[in-house]
Interface confidence: low
């Protein structure tokens, strides 16, 4: 069907006049409002028919739709129909008369209705109200259509503006009736099978006594039909179900299950979709990675979780330093695998008050007959740092030597500092860092060893003072990301005696 | 006032798909009538695809005819583009605009959004 001109909508001049051609490979005619108009039909030198429809001095009161429709059985599709909307703005027209049954809007359930208030010209502003209450109501508004929208049983008038005066429509009257309305519900036991596993999906309704199930599913393409078993659930309320049941899955039985509930009394119907994937093999693939090194903090709990999708249900292991773990007695380390959808999984190591033995290399793996996959990761135990001893020496040379160990988990980093001033020391006064320092006054060397059996760092770092003159304070202090530790001692010179 | 808001744009590969939203907003919105322009640098604003509320009355411009499709939300006071087999040439800025006349004409809307930009590689 091919129009001209186009549209497929058109704002006329009043008075104006104005020609449809509709054209087509068979005979076609002109609708308006269900009625056939005045039009000339024809069929042309080339074999095509057309029907040309001459709207003459047009008025406010030709504003409407218009169709082109095929007007015999001959058409190569029956339901095919094009339309085009025609306004002819008419300022002595306010809305667009309405019959009498129109007035009367009767709404079946709490679904979106119109209110038919039409005017002929696009460009006016249309509010709609209740009768009772001049605020418009915000309600989207169609210039062919009128307002769309929910509404309660009220009555309802629609407002615009021609030029300066007011125009109020016709009163519209909304009814609700009572009807049960449908509530389908469709499962199916698995979304996902492997082929030769069955599928069985469940389509119920509650509180509906005479329905109709319909199905639709891919097997209908090749038209092998399924015959699926009604199953009546007596109770309050009462339910029907329609079971449709394949016994072994194929791999084109993936695709959409609709069923389609209609209940005859009242033309009410409603369908529900599910997608089932049938699949060759299992599958077990992780959803979130974890990065390598994980940190936990000394005496602190820490759950490491890890996320994958499988089918069909995979079984669980973890492992430390390839060494099967399983849930202590003692309740230090918990193991759970949750299943959080159909084909999804949380597996989960909380380790509960860890201890620095914890520290190494864990693995998850999760797999069945037709997949697998592990996920491996270092576990950090960080251990404060302390302070275990802070010595001095005093060599012939004359030369003060300060020893500092300290162990902690990161690597600390050791800071030297010396306050020469006690009395205001430390508090008053920030004292001055310490190390190797040009004029060679002192000489600092720090030595790093990394405990395996501890997981540990231990620091030990010696400062060399070459030349003591007065008492002084001097700090170590180590640090790492877990806090900090330090601890002092009052260096003399080797001349002065020195009493607390 | 009204406001619109388009979203959606981006960079997409010859043959590929897009989904534009445009969402209308303000404290009274009374047009009927909204449509998607879209513009290249240096040249008019092009008629791409237009929609009264019922979705009843639609009109696309032929270039993106079979390929584009307008389509609208009353509760969201929504319009959306679904744009597939996108192709060089669709590379713009597509603009999103509301008025009272179903028209190609870019003088019949009174509102416009800023524009997102589509970009369709070869």
């Known amino acids: 069907l091919v129009i001209t001109p186009p549209g497929p909508e058109f704002v006329l001049n009043i008075s104006s006049t104005f020609v449809l051609t509709c054209s087509s490979s068979a005979p076609v005619m002109w609708e308006q409002m269900s009625q056939v108009p005045w039009q000339e039909a024809a069929m042309n030198q080339d074999g095509t028919f057309s029907s040309v429809l001459t709207l003459t001095n047009v008025t406010g009161g030709d504003t409407g739709e218009y169709f082109c429709v095929y007007n015999n059985s001959l058409g190569p599709e029956l339901s095919e129909r094009k339309r085009i909307y025609i306004f002819v703005p008419d300022p002595t027209m306010g809305f667009l008369p309405m019959d009498s049954e129109d007035l009367f809007i009767f709404v079946t359930d709490v679904t979106e209705t119109t209110i038919p208030c039409r005017v002929t010209d696009p460009q006016l502003e249309v509010t709609l109200h209740e009768k009772k209450v001049d605020i418009p109501l915000h309600v989207p508004y169609d210039h062919q259509r009128g307002f769309i929208g929910t509404f309660e049983d009220k009555t309802y008038i629609c407002k615009t503006t021609i030029g300066d005066r007011e125009v109020d429509s016709d009163t519209y009257y909304v009814y609700s009736l009572q009807v049960s309305s449908i509530n389908v519900s469709v499962n199916a036991v698995q979304t996902v099978v492997r082929q030769g596993e069955s599928i069985t999906i469940r389509c119920i309704v509650m509180g509906n006594d005479v329905v109709n199930f319909q199905w639709t599913y891919p097997r209908m393409k090749s038209g092998r039909l399924v015959e699926p078993v009604t199953d009546y659930l007596f109770g309050v309320p009462s339910r029907i179900g329609s079971i449709l049941h394949i016994p072994t899955a194929e791999l084109s039985d993936s695709g959409t299950y609709t069923c389609n509930v209609s209940v005859s009394v009242n033309d009410h119907g409603d369908e529900k979709a599910i997608n089932v994937t049938v699949i060759e093999n299992g599958y077990v693939r992780l959803l979130e990675t974890l990065e390598d090194v994980q940190i936990a903090e000394l005496h602190r709990s820490r759950t490491l979780q890890v996320v994958f999708e499988a089918y069909p249900t995979p079984s669980v292991l973890w492992f430390k330093d390839n060494r099967t773990l399983g849930d202590s007695s003692a309740g230090e380390l918990v193991l759970s695998t949750r299943n959080v959808s159909e084909t999804r999984y949380v597996s989960e190591l909380t380790l509960v008050r860890v201890k620095v033995s914890e520290a190494g290399y864990y693995t998850m793996r999760a797999f069945h007959a037709d997949d697998q996959v592990q996920l491996s990761f270092k576990l950090q135990v960080n251990v404060p740092v302390r302070v275990l001893e802070l010595s001095e020496s005093h060599p012939a040379n004359g030369e003060q030597i300060l020893r500092c160990r300290g162990r902690g988990m990161p690597q600390p980093n050791v800071t030297w500092s010396t306050c020469r001033d006690l009395k205001r020391c430390p508090r008053k006064l920030s004292p001055t860092p310490l190390g190797n320092s040009s004029k060679e006054e002192s000489q600092l060397e720090t030595n790093v060893t990394f405990w395996e059996e501890d997981q540990e760092y231990e620091v030990v770092s010696t400062l060399r003072l070459r030349h003591v003159d007065q008492p002084l304070s001097v700090r170590c202090m180590l640090q790492n990301s877990m806090g900090r530790d330090s601890q002092e001692v009052t260096v003399v010179p080797h001349s002065l005696p020195f009493k607390v | 006032e009204v406001q619109l808001v388009e979203s959606g744009g981006g960079l997409v590969q010859a043959g590929g798909s897009l989904r534009l939203s445009c969402a209308a907003s303000?404290?009274?919105?009374?047009?009927?009538?909204m449509g998607w322009f879209r513009q290249t640098p240096g040249k008019e604003r092009e008629f791409v695809a237009a929609?009264?509320?019922?979705?009843?009355?639609?009109h696309y411009a032929d270039s993106v005819k079979g390929r584009f499709t307008i389509s609208r939300d009353h509760a969201e006071n929504a319009v959306f583009l679904q744009m597939n087999s996108l192709k060089p040439e669709d590379t713009a800025v597509y603009y999103c605009?509301?008025?009272?006349?179903?028209?190609?004409?870019?003088?019949?809307?009174?509102?416009w959004g800023q524009g997102t930009q589509v970009t369709v590689s070869s």
């Open positions: 929609t009264r509320w019922t979705a009843a009355s639609t």
């Open positions: 303000g404290r009274s919105f009374s047009s009927s009538v």
């Open positions: 605009a509301a008025g009272n006349y179903l028209d190609t004409a870019q003088y019949r809307y009174n509102y």
